[in-house]
């Protein structure tokens, strides 16, 4: 509309009492340069009079008159474009509409800002994304409509009543658009930041306390688990019984599924809290974990490292290297699965026990002849003592000796 | 072609020592085992100790554990019986003899030397 003044301003200004207001603002007078502007607090058009009633904050005219608020309110435009005002301090007494009253050599405009000046610091707004998600990244968001040149104040972020140790980006915006200070916080949440408060605090430039927002995190999580077991030690001998539990100590949303996991792989038919091995076997030692799930994902346990311990297996014995040749060395090596590991060996000669020769290993530096012949062994740990194998066959290769011609 | 010659035996009175050596010689030296036997009249004979040439400790029989010690000398394919605490019960003719491994057995041992007579007084 070309018969109005054009004016850009923040439709509404926010204070609280003892601070101050910054009030961006341009125009465009219908025509020609302003020749007198006069801040009205409250303005109210006389008929009578054809005139706005109000308290002057300000007067700027031609012959120089100046209200005693005038050191309070200082108009910082100029005569064509800035409108630009500020008060210092402000009052809550201040909080209404303030009306701008312009006049050029022919036109005349009154145009209304809201101000609303509140008696202790307002709190800021914290901004949280929709979802958060244990491990992903987020920014938080603390916004406070409100910034002034002549008040400093900072936005400090709390969890749990300490400052998080994350750097804050702090922007403030000044503009005719908007008005605010802002503080934004990338931070990775973890499952244990879940329930937890999340603070930020307005204070003034000596860190004094002026107000607070708080929210409560709400951190998606897969379920976190704790596995027992008995015994605590998860050392058991074959035809003993082991339980395993599993704890769930934080899912967020609730848990939906429960399995257990040997080795990695799932067992089948075990969907309950509880896994109950009995009449164990050799075979079922491994690796245990429980595996829990809900709508973020599956949550798996520690693992728990189920040792059954049996006595050895029936022994075999491996040679390093038959057939050998006279004068070589030879390396003979009992082996036999057991747990825990065999601590004595007894190894035999064409049947005979070898005395003295405990080890795993039997080893000859210098193969003779009589050496030839079947080697067995048998191993022994705390459980027992295991069976004799078939042996292994020695073959040494000589020369002729005692050469007779016939 | 193995040799076996034992030294050293002789009349001690009880509490006395005495050293018996066995000296190999031919392919039984170098490798393979030295077993002690003792023979008492009347009696069969008895495993005493035994070593490796190669590796190993000796082996010793319950009789004599503590008060005889086995070494061995493979420079001068030798083994040395140190035999301390002597009781007249330990009188008997001594044989060394050698096995590709150190057995309990005396049927286990492939050569034999001739003996040598300890007879131990009270």
């Known amino acids: 509309d070309s018969s109005k003044w054009v004016f850009e301003h923040p439709e509404t200004l926010y204070a609280w009492e003892g601070a101050c207001v910054w009030i961006p603002c341009t125009y465009r007078a219908l025509d020609g340069d302003l020749e007198s502007f006069i801040l009205f607090h409250n303005p109210e058009y006389n008929k009578n009079t054809s005139k706005f009633d109000g308290t002057r904050l300000y007067e700027s005219t031609k012959d120089g008159k100046v209200p005693s608020e005038q050191k309070r309110v200082q108009f910082l435009g100029d005569k064509n474009k800035n409108c630009t005002l500020s008060i210092h301090p402000v009052h809550l007494n201040d909080s209404g509409q303030l009306g701008l009253r312009m006049e050029s050599k022919t036109e005349k405009w009154m145009e209304r800002i809201h101000l609303n000046v509140s008696e202790r610091p307002f709190p800021p707004h914290i901004q949280l994304p929709p979802e958060i998600q244990e491990s992903q990244e987020v920014t938080l968001t603390c916004l406070l409509n409100f910034s002034c040149y002549g008040y400093p104040i900072q936005l400090q972020w709390l969890l749990e009543g300490v400052p998080m140790r994350q750097a804050a980006v702090t922007s403030t915006s000044l503009t005719i658009k908007s008005v605010f200070t802002r503080s934004e916080l990338k931070f990775s949440p973890q499952w244990s930041h879940h329930g937890k408060i999340v603070t930020c605090q307005l204070q003034d430039a000596d860190g004094k306390f002026l107000s607070n927002d708080t929210v409560q995190l709400n951190v998606k999580h897969t379920p976190k688990l704790e596995i027992k077991v008995t015994p605590s030690d998860a050392i058991v001998r074959e035809g003993d019984s082991v339980t395993m539990t599993c704890e769930v100590s934080s899912s967020n949303p609730e848990y939906t599924t429960v399995s257990w996991l040997k080795d990695g792989t799932s067992l089948k038919k075990q969907n309950t809290f509880t896994l109950n091995l009995r009449e164990v076997t050799k075979d079922q030692s491994g690796k245990y974990c429980c595996q829990v799930s809900n709508d973020v994902g599956p949550g798996r346990s520690e693992e728990v490292f189920l040792q059954v311990q049996y006595a050895p297996e029936p022994s075999t014995v491996q040679i390093l290297h038959s057939p050998a040749v006279e004068g070589s060395q030879v390396e003979f090596l009992c082996m036999s699965l057991a747990n825990p590991l065999p601590t004595n060996y007894t190894w035999y000669h064409n049947g005979k026990e070898m005395q003295g020769r405990t080890e795993e290993k039997v080893h000859i530096p210098k193969i003779l002849p009589w050496h030839a012949g079947t080697y067995s062994c048998v191993a022994e740990n705390i459980l027992g003592t295991g069976q004799r194998g078939p042996g292994a066959e020695l073959d040494v290769q000589y020369p002729p000796k005692k050469v007779t011609t016939v | 072609q193995v040799q076996l010659v034992e030294s050293g035996g002789g009349l001690v009175q009880a509490g006395g020592s005495l050293r018996l050596s066995c000296a190999a010689s031919?392919?039984?030296?170098?490798?393979?085992?030295m077993g002690w036997f003792r023979q008492a009249p009347g009696q069969e004979r008895r495993f005493v100790a035994g070593?490796?040439?190669?590796?190993?400790?000796?082996v010793y029989a319950d009789s004599v554990k503590g008060r005889f010690t086995l070494s061995r000398d493979n420079a001068k394919n030798t083994v040395h019986l140190q035999m301390n605490s002597l009781k007249p019960e330990d009188t008997a003719v001594y044989y060394c003899?050698?096995?590709?491994?150190?057995?309990?057995?005396?049927?286990?041992?492939?050569?034999w030397g001739q003996g040598t007579q300890v007879t131990v007084s009270s």
């Open positions: 031919g392919r039984a030296s170098g490798s393979g085992a």
């Open positions: 003899a050698a096995a590709p491994w150190v057995f309990s057995s005396p049927d286990d041992y492939m050569y």
């Open positions: 070593i490796e040439w190669s590796s190993g400790g000796p």
